[in-house]
């Protein structure tokens, strides 16, 4: 049960995380005009990865897309690339993890295949989360650098008579959404990897052992119990008798090589 819960929770957390990464990537408020210690203006500027916007004091907002590719800063292009890679990996990870979910039955898929898929999706979520965190952090670093540069040159003018106030930008909401979403995707990925360990059938070194109990015929083979779920490595090796109802994840004692002398 714990494995299913861990896998399911990992999937949900990653799903929320990837939705957050997509939202952050699409948001316009990656950087917002710094209002602290600045003259109050009738306009408010904010910028995203794809367009910049100006909101008048009336609330009327006008946005302009960045219709150039070559004219954009390399750092912005890098952030875009990281976010898109994060989204693509996350989306593929979600697709893979849906089929890997223990609670979903697809034909006669083996447990080892589910375990592998869970691990694959987990790794994809981890990389996706790291991409998002890296992208957001690169952008944040760019903002901090520009902020202090514009603070140093805040007032430039002709003989101090005419002043030009440079618009300074600070962290926008999208950065925080991106950090949280990237973190959630990362956590979801780790949970999937942990779940994978519980899903993988245990490798045993002994050969199949058979014994006859009076009145009952029970054939034990490695992976025998798992086979009863219909997901096992060999569906022909189903346990003929199960002495009591058990849940799929309940601990099953396998015969140890030390049990037979």
């Amino acid at each position: 049960m714990a494995v299913t819960a861990c896998q399911g929770l990992g999937f949900v957390v990653s799903l929320i995380g990837i939705a957050g990464i997509i939202a952050a990537t699409c948001m316009d408020q990656w950087s917002t005009q710094d209002l602290y210690n600045n003259p109050v203006t009738a306009v408010f500027n904010y910028q995203g990865l794809w367009r910049s916007c100006v909101r008048e004091s009336s609330g009327f907002t006008e946005c302009r897309g960045y219709f150039t590719l070559l004219g954009l800063p390399a750092m912005l292009q890098a952030v875009r690339a990281l976010m898109i890679v994060g989204i693509v990996l996350g989306a593929i990870g979600l697709l893979v993890s849906i089929f890997a979910l223990k609670c979903i039955r697809i034909g006669s898929m083996e447990d080892s295949a589910k375990a592998n898929m869970t691990l694959t999706s987990g790794i994809m979520f981890i990389v996706s989360g790291l991409c998002a965190i890296a992208g957001v952090s690169v952008f944040a670093n760019m903002l901090v650098t520009n902020f202090w540069m514009s603070t140093a040159n805040m007032y430039t003018g002709m003989g101090g008579m005419v002043q030009t106030v440079q618009t300074r930008y600070t962290f926008g909401a999208a950065l925080f959404v991106g950090w949280v979403a990237g973190g959630l995707t990362l956590i979801g990925g780790v949970m999937m990897c942990i779940a994978c360990r519980g899903l993988a059938p245990e490798e045993t070194n002994y050969k199949a052992v058979s014994y006859h109990a009076s009145g009952h015929s029970v054939a034990y083979k490695p992976g025998g119990f798992k086979a009863s779920t219909g997901f096992g490595s060999n569906t022909k090796n189903k346990k003929i008798y199960d002495g009591g109802a058990r849940t799929e994840d309940e601990v099953q004692s396998y015969p140890s090589k030390h049990d037979y002398v």
């Epitope: 009738a42 910049s52 008048e56 009336s58």
Partner: antibody, heavy 119, light 113 residues
Framework: QITQKESGPGILQPSQTLSLTCSLS??????????VGWIRQPSGKGLEWLAH???????YYNTALKSRLTISKDTSNNQVFLKIASVDTADTATYYC???????????WGQGTLVTVSA | DIVMTQSPSSLTVTAGEKVTMSCKSS????????????LTWYQQKPGQPPKLLIY???TRESGVPDRFTGSGSGTDFTLTISSVQAEDLAVYYC?????????FGSGTKLEIK
Amino acid sequence: QITQKESGPGILQPSQTLSLTCSLSGFSLSTYFIGVGWIRQPSGKGLEWLAHIWWNDNKYYNTALKSRLTISKDTSNNQVFLKIASVDTADTATYYCARMGSGAWFTYWGQGTLVTVSA
Amino acid sequence: DIVMTQSPSSLTVTAGEKVTMSCKSSQSLLNSGNQKNYLTWYQQKPGQPPKLLIYWASTRESGVPDRFTGSGSGTDFTLTISSVQAEDLAVYYCQNDYYYPLTFGSGTKLEIK
């Protein structure tokens, strides 16, 4: 047709509170991005912005007069009000009410109302 | 507060002449976000309220004759009337609509010979 008509007391004494009303027609105060402002002009002098209010109740005041100014609106009656506390003779002017554009400029002006502060 | 300085304070021209008047602001009115200059020009004829002519430094309000042209960027702005008509007799004001408090210039009085 967009019109705005200002009304005021005409004459009042120093230290009293000046109450001005701007009655609007041709547009609604609840419409997105609509704003109404007050500007005054002493006789033969220049224009001075006092305050304005937006459709979403955002208010902006002239910092030099902020402590004495109160702007408000009554959306149902399509009216904007301005109160100026503790008036003195320097407040004698023609007071204009104006509708604002999407930005902080004034697109349509009323005819103005002359207010005289006299002892 | 932003100081708006208009020059000349008055000028007298003959009908049909080209006229230019200047407005300077103590700080740049150019918004980096949209590259627009937040400066507005008004015309106030004797005994009338002001009338909007130009906003965003160069965008003519609908119904304003095309002989009125606004130009300039940053801190220096100009209003040009290409061919003055008798009805252009008025005081022209510029307004900073970028920084609060909103401020007006002292005006340029245009007189016709």
